[in-house]
Amino acid sequence: TSHLVKCAEKEKTFCVNGGECFMVKDLSNPSRYLCKCQPGFTGARCTENVPMKVQNQEKAEELYQK
């Protein structure tokens, strides 16, 4: 089984554009990293800009779910 832990201070720059870094702890595999991106960004390292249209759509869905 695997679980997520917040990255150590020295690993935080794995993600760009202010993305939050997490490490996937998995006993059977080497550690790997994931990014939780800030609004407006996406991609493995949060490098990609989310088009405005998509951002608005996501906000609308968020509000609907609330």
Epitope: E9, K10, E11, K12, T13, F14, V16, N17, G18, R32, G43, A44, R45, T47, E48
Partner: antibody, heavy 116, light 107 residues
Framework: EVQLVESGGGLVQPGGSLRLSCAAS????????IHWVRQAPGKGLEWVAA????????NYADSVKGRFTISADTSKNTAYLQMNSLRAEDTAVYYC?????????WGQGTLVTVSS | DIQMTQSPSSLSASVGDRVTITCRAS??????LAWYQQKPGKAPKLLIY???NLESGVPSRFSGSGSGTDFTLTISSLQPEDFATYYC?????????FGQGTKVEIK
């Protein structure tokens, strides 16, 4: 041991094309982030392009957008920089580098000279 | 794009001196600031990343500090092999941008 070896540089005329290669070994290529950085003679460092081999996502500096294409072949552990419509100002040593938490490993560089 | 400004552009120092190089970003880059050392004809070498994290294998006389827009690289006791050019780089957002470099020369 991590190794990056660039090749493909040379002399090319303005408007010409060149493809640079960056052969990687000693690490999991598909799990990294590969960047190209260049340095004009006697000048500083300029970031050029990046690719995430795992998903193929790419990014470019405005100065090369539409002219340069970065790609990667995970089966060959090699990244490429296809350079078209070359200009005199593209003359530089081109380095590839891996990025984990910063640009931690660099190749030795390959010189591209654009001149008639 | 984020502009990176290094100072000084060059400095002369003696072996054993304490050397400080500063780097200023045109906007907040949090702690995403790296320092590289480059010797003539060679590729840059990573010294510090995340503003203050020493890269593996780099001597402890090198240290980095700062966050936001103002950063410092310090060499506590300059050694003969430290004479080189040093570059700062923001790695907060693409395009990653470098300072213009600081050349450390022998006095």
């Amino acid at each position: 041991e991590v190794q990056l070896v660039e090749s493909g540089g040379g002399l090319v005329q303005p408007g010409g094309s060149l493809r640079l290669s960056c052969a990687a070994s000693g690490f999991t290529f598909s799990g990294t982030w590969i960047h190209w950085v260049r340095q004009a003679p006697g000048k500083g460092l300029e970031w050029v392009a990046a690719i995430t081999p795992a998903d193929g996502s790419t990014n470019y500096a405005d100065s090369v957008k539409g002219r340069f294409t970065i790609s990667a072949d995970t089966s060959k552990n090699t990244a490429y920089l296809q350079m078209n419509s070359l200009r005199a100002e593209d003359t530089a040593v081109y380095y590839c580098a891996t990025y984990m938490f910063a640009m931690d490993y660099w190749g030795q560089g390959t010189l591209v000279t654009v001149s008639s | 794009d984020i502009q990176m400004t290094q100072s000084p552009s060059s400095l002369s120092a003696s072996v054993g001196d304490r050397v400080t190089i500063t780097c200023r970003a045109s906007q907040d880059v949090s702690i995403s600031l790296a320092w590289y050392q480059q010797k003539p004809g060679k590729a840059p070498k990573l010294l510090i990343y995340g503003a203050s994290n020493l890269e593996s294998g780099v001597p402890s006389r090198f240290s980095g500090s700062g966050s936001g827009t103002d950063f410092t690289l310090t060499i506590s006791s300059l050694q003969p092999e430290d004479f080189a050019t040093y570059y700062c780089q923001q790695h907060y957002t693409l395009p990653f941008t470098f300072g213009q470099g600081t050349k450390v020369e022998i006095k």
